[in-house]
């Protein structure tokens, strides 16, 4: 019995797990460099926006070294060659977003540092359905490197529902890495840091499409899974790392046979996190229902290290550690459809619980 | 509802130029500044094909059959993506469509562009 992310104590541990995921838990205190900051100030305020990462760019100089592109402050012009807007966003100078788009000083922003004591169980969070996931080979998807992640635009008809009468339509997916010496998942469990991670975009079918919904409670939905290192390999993420070298410049698009994206995620859609923050990337707009499954994905050794070093991004440099320094959570709850806070501790003095209207 | 909008297309004579513009309208949020942005065209008879693509970090990429006569630009200020089209040939006759792809793909109605004598 795989255990869950909530159940470890020490490092992640790979467990048999025959559907080619994992359950993990990480209990003990993470390695340093990925360890919050700070301690939470006792009133329980998040501590401010400026995380560990940002602070160790800008006090070592680590951007050029660390980033598939150099900052912004570096290439002269921040904005565009003619225009005068900054259009231009890299993940080396990530403080400059706001300049970009100013809905990524927000409040709710994401990615976010789960901390598992503090999730609340909550028991009306039902397993996800997903329809019409298993695409066949034809019609073909686009598969492109846009210079900041390898993206598959998905076809209409993959339908998500995240509760009675809360549908979505998948639009894309995408894929978040480090190196093949640093983990490069977005979101983090208790301050660790996974090697990777994928996001798949979904549109609320309350609207006909994207721009309507962007900034709007519940306009899109993201389905996150970590992806983890394993002996086997993974043959449905086999479909896509194949391509990555037809892809490796940057503006690259090339077909793909259709594929399962289902099996991209976990099969156990039943456990998960769920809070509300942004898109990840500029315009970092709000709204954004965030499901973050805690069941891992596994793929070997190889298949994560092909995806760490086969795409290049602006002037030449690798695209690597393409995530984003956790937000804080300014408030906000993070819920669990099952009991993480209660398994995160030996002796929980209390289990936060969810309430909503009713109850 | 975001609408792209070709431009400039028309005849032209073979050697000769001709500046494409796709220009995004009716969103709240500029879609250039955070979309790549491509030129794509087909032929009578033809698949529709890449010709160029601007990604949002300023990168740009070409078909070979282009390279070195077609330069893609933006202007993001004016939420305007730009195809300027040098020593035209024959086989250039197309319908150009932009597309931008940010999340979702959005395509433009197209404009055409006929190289001839």
């Known amino acids: 019995q795989p255990q869950g992310l909530s159940g470890m104590q020490g490092e992640p541990s790979l467990g048999d797990s025959s559907s080619g995921e994992d359950e993990l838990g990480v209990d003990v205190l993470p390695s340093e460099e990925d360890a919050p900051e700070e301690a939470d100030p006792p009133d329980g305020e998040d501590p401010p926006e400026v995380n560990s990462e940002d602070r160790m760019e800008e006090s070592l100089g680590l951007e050029d070294l660390s980033t598939p592109e150099a900052p912004e402050h570096s290439q002269g012009s921040h904005g565009d060659e003619k225009g005068g807007g900054h259009s231009h966003w890299s993940y080396g100078g990530t403080l400059l977003w706001p300049q970009v788009s100013p809905a990524c000083a927000g409040r709710f922003q994401s990615p976010v540092d789960i901390r598992l004591e503090r999730t609340a169980f909550c028991r009306t969070l039902q397993p996800l359905e997903l329809l019409g996931y298993e695409l066949q080979p034809l019609p073909e998807l686009s598969l492109s490197n846009n210079g900041h992640t390898v993206q598959l635009t998905l076809p209409p008809g993959l339908k998500m529902a995240l509760g009675p009468g809360q549908e979505y339509r998948a639009l894309q997916l995408h894929l978040h890495w480090g190196t093949s010496d640093h983990p490069g998942s977005e979101h983090t469990v208790n301050g660790h840091r996974f090697p990777a991670e994928i996001h798949v975009v979904h549109l609320s079918t309350a609207f006909s499409e994207l721009h309507e919904a962007l900034g709007r409670p519940g306009g899109l939905a993201v389905l996150a899974a970590f992806l983890q290192e394993s002996p086997e390999e993974n043959s449905a993420y086999e479909q896509l790392l194949s391509h990555l070298e037809e892809i490796s410049e940057e503006g690259s698009k090339i077909e793909i046979p259709g594929l399962d994206v289902s099996a991209l995620l976990p099969s156990d859609l039943s456990r998960y996190y769920r809070y509300e923050g942004s898109l990840t990337t500029p315009p970092c707009s709000q709204g954004v229902i965030w499901t973050v499954f805690n069941e891992t994905v596994k793929l070997s050794a190889k298949q994560l290290h092909t995806l760490s070093v086969s795409l290049w991004g602006p002037r030449d440099s690798r695209l690597q550690l393409n995530f984003r320094a956790t937000q804080p959570l300014n408030g906000r709850t993070i819920e669990a459809s099952f009991p993480a806070a209660e398994d995160s501790s030996p002796e929980p003095v209390h289990v936060n619980s969810c309430f909503t209207a009713g109850d | 509802e975001v609408q792209l909008l070709e431009s400039g297309g028309g005849l032209v004579q073979p050697g000769g130029s001709r500046r494409l513009s796709c220009a995004a309208s009716?969103?709240?949020?500029?879609?250039?500044?955070?979309?790549?942005v491509a030129w794509y065209r087909q032929a009578p008879g033809k698949q529709r094909e890449l010709v160029a693509v601007i990604t949002t970090t300023g990168g740009t990429k070409y078909s070979d059959s282009v390279k070195g006569r077609f330069t893609i630009s933006r202007d993001s200020s004016k939420n305007t993506v730009y195809l300027q089209m040098n020593s035209l040939r024959a086989e250039d006759t197309a319908v150009y469509y932009c597309?931008?792809?940010?999340?979702?793909?959005?395509w433009g109605q197209g404009t055409q562009v006929t190289v001839s004598s």
């Open positions: 597309n931008a792809d940010y999340l979702q793909d959005y």
């Open positions: 009716g969103n709240s949020v500029n879609i250039f500044s955070f979309a790549a």
